[in-house]
């Protein structure tokens, strides 16, 4: 007995589409083997019409597709524009057509019902508008016009020309009588409901000479489009509901129990808490179409989504809708990365951003998610050397470690930096990921002067104190610019005396600038790293002024440190704070990471990899 399962019989009518789901045991081999749909011939062979390896028969060109859903152990064959020639016996299967891993499906396509019994068939999508046309003869031009709906055995009046409207249709139906030249009246029903479907009879006149016309109204619940995305990746729902609802509030909702559809986001400003920080509703076009992007996909995001238009901003009977069934593939190609990164005021964070390694040349971006209105994500930095002005000197996007990951370092943290940030590229849009930065209590690990002034032509030495916890890390100084942070020579000056309870493994590493020039003015970072993985950083702004007295300058912590939250007004720059960065190696291990942040009282930082537990920033 074949383990493949599907519908034994599918009945449809000409012009329609069918969507045939075939189920298979989701073993590793089955998931990856060829899937096919073939038509059985009279002599027992089975001619392939479409397969998962890209083959499409000329008979199916432009009207069929086959989609595999390995996570579910299903594949779906969609066939459009059916004709009676498509009637026959088919197989859906795995592997080679003749090997028996298949299921027999009988497809029967009959003539459309619109061709039968003088009944005009109207097939309209849920929430849309239908116009039922009713012809009549001259002798009935002045007589009552009416539309009935067949309920069981009895016709029930829906609307008539005397002004009656059935309560089920109030506010969404009208009867139009054309000008005297046209012997036609029409009934327009808006915001169609599933319950509107059925047999209608329109009539002109009430006696035996009345004119009658039958109509069959089919209201289509939209078949959900199947969407298959990777865990931790992103999905975009494109919603085009038509210009007639261009000025009506739009929504995306997720079906839960029964008929309920919980609003995920709408244009009235509502957003479900579960999607905070990872959803954007893109502004709609003039034609009323819009799109919703969700990043950081979770297993529980899977389900049926509807987009629609209604003044309430939520699903109501008669809302025009589009539907999707979202599957979230847990065998994701997108690597795990922390969903929460913690740092302290005055400290720093280093965020690892995954991207599709096939697109190493793509431009990388980092943006800050803003929840106002429908959500937006203004860019802060890119890999082409652009940094938003307010972030100069404290934000850098590095291509390292490469091979599918880039790093973003943000230092001089303040409480205002808490929030959600998105990693993205101009390549594969499915690789958008989200990270939340949280500011926690604590002190920065690295200690540097708060502000430094150098004298033209003299030598400047700037200290950076590294606690013993970083004894095994590479320590560096670099000069920040828009494209990164260029490494500079530095000197290890032995153990630091800046730390209580810290042994000989603490270090004081100094940056020396000889014969200072105007070009030396700018931001300097000291930091730690292991290979291409960056840890904490701290930043110092070096101002350059004219010579006042001879000699070299040695800057100490005591003389130059800025107080917590103090604005360094004399240098004309924003407050200068200590910073430190999380060590990405630790991200990968999903362990707590030592990290410092924005307050001058500083603290350590740690990261979370998607679990609801947040790890503390204990030192290691």
């Amino acid at each position: 007995k074949s383990p493949i399962f599907g519908p034994e019989e599918v009945n449809s009518v000409e012009g329609n589409s069918v969507s045939i789901t075939c189920y298979y045991p989701p073993t590793s081999v089955n998931r990856h083997t060829r899937k096919y749909w073939c038509r059985q011939g009279a002599r027992g062979g089975c001619i392939t019409l479409i397969s998962s390896e890209g083959y499409v028969s000329s008979k199916y060109a432009g009207r069929a597709n086959l989609t595999n859903f390995p996570e579910n152990g299903t594949f779906v064959v969609n066939i459009a524009q059916l004709s009676q020639d498509d009637s026959g016996r088919y197989k859906c299967g795995l592997g080679i057509n003749s090997r028996g891993l298949s299921f027999d499906v009988s497809l029967e396509v009959s003539q459309g019902p619109g061709l039968l019994n003088d009944t005009k068939v109207y097939t309209v999508d849920l929430g849309r508008t239908v116009t039922i046309n009713c012809p009549f003869k001259t002798e009935n031009a002045q007589k009552r016009k009416s539309l009935y709906k067949q309920i069981g055995l009895y016709p029930v009046l829906v609307i008539d020309s005397s002004g009656y409207v059935n309560p089920n249709y109030t506010g969404r139906i009208r009867l139009d009588i054309q000008g005297t030249g046209q012997l036609l009246f029409s009934v327009v029903i808006n915001q169609l409901r599933l319950s509107d479907a059925g047999q209608y009879l329109c009539q002109a006149g009430d006696d035996s000479n009345s004119n009658k016309k039958n109509a069959d109204l089919q209201v289509l619940k939209p078949e959900p489009e199947l969407v298959y995305e990777d865990l931790r990746g992103s999905v975009t729902f494109h919603c085009a509901l038509g210009p007639e609802v261009a000025n009506v509030a739009k929504f995306l909702c997720r079906q839960s129990s029964g008929e309920n559809c919980d609003v995920v986001v709408n244009t009235l400003g509502k957003r479900a808490p579960a999607f905070e920080g990872r959803i954007l509703l893109n502004p709609q076009d003039k034609d009323g179409s819009f799109s919703v992007v969700i990043t950081g996909l979770r297993k529980e995001d899977a389900g049926r989504y509807l987009c629609g238009a209604h003044s309430d901003g939520q699903l109501q009977e008669g809302s025009p809708i589009q539907a999707w069934q979202l599957f979230v593939n847990e065998e994701s190609t997108i690597p795990r990365s922390p969903t929460v990164v913690k740092g302290v005021a005055g400290g720093s964070v280093a965020v690892l951003c995954p991207y599709n390694r096939k697109e190493s040349k793509s431009i990388k971006y980092w943006c800050l998610w803003e929840g106002a209105q429908n959500g937006r994500c203004p860019l802060l930095v890119d890999s082409e050397g652009w940094v938003k002005a307010q972030y100069e000197g404290r934000l850098s996007l590095l291509e390292e470690p490469g091979n599918g990951t880039f790093t973003v370092i943000l230092n001089q943290l303040t409480s205002r930096d808490a929030g959600f940030y998105w990693c993205l590229t101009n390549g594969d849009t499915l690789w958008r990921t989200t990270v939340e930065i949280k500011i926690i209590e604590g002190e920065p690990n690295l200690k540097v002067p708060g502000n430094v002034t150098a004298v033209l032509g003299e030598t400047l030495k700037v200290p950076c104190h590294f606690p013993c916890k970083f004894s095994s890390y590479e320590k560096y100084w670099c000069k920040w610019n828009n494209t990164g942070c260029q490494a500079l020579p530095s000197q290890d000056e032995g153990p630091s005396k800046a730390f209580v309870n810290c042994d000989e493994n603490s270090r004081l590493v100094s940056l020396t600038l000889n014969l200072v020039t105007r070009a030396d003015e700018g931001w300097y970072w000291c930091g730690v790293k292991q290979g291409h993985f960056y840890g904490e950083t701290a930043a110092v702004y070096v101002a350059v002024e004219e010579r006042k007295a001879a000699g070299s300058r040695d800057v100490s912590l005591a003389k130059a440190d800025a107080a917590p939250d103090e604005k360094v007004l004399d240098s004309g720059f924003r407050e200068i704070e200590n910073k430190a960065i999380q060590d990405p190696r630790l991200f990968a291990e999903e362990k707590a990471v030592a990290d410092t942040r924005d307050q001058a009282d500083g603290s350590r930082a740690s990261v979370d990899s998607g679990s609801s537990e947040e790890q503390g920033g204990s030192s290691r």
Epitope: F5, N11, K221, Q255, S257, G258
Partner: nanobody, 128 residues
Framework: EVQLVESGGGLVQAGGSLRLSCAAS????????VGWFRQAPGKEREFVAH???????????YYGDFVKGRFTISRGTAKNTVYLQMNSLKPEDTAVYYC??????????????????WGQGTLVTVSS
């Protein structure tokens, strides 16, 4: 509240036929799929048949392995009734037959977990 009510069960001789009905009621019922399952004494509930329709005259019919052309699932003209026509009945078809409906989109129609509404069942006894 949605209610599913099965009827048409009873005692029949081997080789005979029965037609089971499943009537749905309730203001919120708008399912476009109904399944039949059966449960013999001391056994697990077993998939019998499933029908899924869309408003554009397309209908999909699924059957359990053991059916082998003996049973036919269909939808009544009232649109809220589904039938299971059972022919060539065998003693091993003796069971309580249940109809079930999902709230929304369905995955594998053979899985009881996919269905949200269940009837109370109707007993079919096939004597030899």
């Amino acid at each position: 509240e949605v209610q599913l009510v099965e009827s048409g069960g009873g005692l029949v001789q081997a080789g005979g036929s029965l037609r089971l009905s499943c009537a749905a009621s309730g203001r919120t019922f708008s399912s476009d799929a109904v399944g039949w399952f059966r449960q013999a004494p001391g056994k697990e509930r077993e998939f019998v048949a499933h029908i899924h329709w869309s408003g554009d005259f397309t209908t999909y019919y699924y059957y359990g392995d053991f059916v082998k052309g003996r049973f036919t699932i269909s939808r009544g003209t009232a649109k809220n009734t589904v039938y299971l026509q059972m022919n060539s009945l065998k003693p091993e078809d003796t069971a309580v037959y249940y109809c079930a409906a999902p709230k929304g989109a369905i995955g594998d129609p053979r899985s009881t977990r996919e269905y949200d509404y269940w009837g109370q069942g109707t007993l079919v006894t096939v004597s030899s």
